[in-house]
């Protein structure tokens, strides 16, 4: 259903966004896979204290997809 | 070559607000996490602020929380530092920094720094 | 918070000698995360090694570093009167925590 609340991101997938652009320009050989691989390992060797930020911002969103999903099904809308 | 210029820095007192800014060349600035590191007189480094290459995340020592927002804007490959409620123990001279990484994060390009000085 | 302790504070040697500087880590470190800084008066800090033991580009071979459960070591093998300056080492483990600082002075 395109009306749906979309699906929420995680911390990683919001972490990915800001570096992706980054592994793609400096290695445009790589494949998908490879960049996945490249922002895991640079995800995993990030500061607990610097994944906060991205863990709060998942949180927000998370918050905000659950008041939008109750509000999508209270109108009477399937899952 | 990548370059970072920092400027804005100069003599405020007490309580006051100065406002700095890194221009960044020589490099796709809006790839990169920046920092701001500074270094009182005499004394080592220490670290100030981060933000990501978006600017959508951003981080503080607890020795600046509530007190200085960073913020970046990619069009103009520019970081700022706007610094309210200054200290004295806030003078220092202040570096800005690229982050990045390779197996490991560390700072691979650092400014020439920018004087704060706060006294009355 | 994670401290980062540097030995000795100061360390006087001359041109020719071999320089080891040592940094130990309150807590577990992660070594990938781990680098070396060298800062001359009225200069920027400049990037040595990272990850522990990766040289930084157009860095010297005689600049080495290792490392050995919490303790870091910087080795100089044959100082040049260059390598004179202010070390620093460097960890993100949690936020990002400098060592005071070695001061690496001429004998």
């Known amino acids: 259903d395109p009306n749906a609340p979309k699906r929420l991101p995680s911390a990683f997938f919001l972490f990915c966004s800001e570096y992706r652009p980054k592994i793609k320009g400096e290695h445009p050989g790589l494949s998908i896979g490879d960049v996945a691989k490249k922002l895991g390992e640079m995800w995993n060797n990030t500061a607990a204290d610097d994944k906060q930020p991205y863990e709060k911002k998942a949180a927000k969103l998370k918050e905000k997809y659950e008041k939008d999903i109750a509000a999508y099904r209270a109108k009477g809308k399937p899952d | 070559e990548v370059q970072l210029l920092e400027s804005g820095g100069g003599l405020v007192q007490p309580g006051g607000s100065l406002r700095l800014s890194c221009a960044a060349s020589?490099?796709?600035?809006?790839?990169?996490?920046m920092l701001w590191v500074r270094q009182a007189p005499g004394k080592g480094l220490e670290w100030v602020s981060y933000i990501s290459p978006s600017g959508g995340f951003t981080n503080y020592a607890d020795s600046v929380k509530g007190r200085f927002t960073i913020s970046r804007d990619n069009s103009k490959n520019t970081l700022y530092l706007q610094m309210n409620s200054l200290r004295a123990e806030d003078t220092a001279v202040y570096y800005c920094?690229?982050?990045?990484?390779?197996?490991?994060?560390?700072?691979?390009?650092w400014g020439q720094g920018t004087l704060v000085t706060v006294s009355s | 918070d994670i401290q980062m302790t540097q030995s000795p504070d100061t360390l006087s040697l001359s041109p020719g000698e071999r320089a080891t500087l040592s940094c130990r880590a309150s807590?577990?470190?992660?070594?990938?995360?781990l680098a070396w800084y060298q800062q001359k008066p009225g200069q920027a800090p400049r990037l040595l090694i990272y990850?522990?033991?990766t040289r930084a580009t157009g860095i010297p071979d005689r600049f080495s570093g290792s490392v050995s459960g919490t303790e870091f070591t910087l080795t100089i093998s044959s100082l040049q009167p260059d390598d004179f300056a202010t070390y620093y080492c460097q960890q993100y483990n949690s936020y990002f925590t400098f060592g005071q600082g070695t001061k690496l002075e001429i004998k």
């Open positions: 807590q577990s470190v992660n070594s990938r995360n």
């Open positions: 990850g522990a033991s």
């Open positions: 020589g490099f796709t600035f809006s790839w990169y996490s």
């Open positions: 920094a690229r982050w990045d990484y390779n197996s490991g994060w560390y700072y691979d390009h």
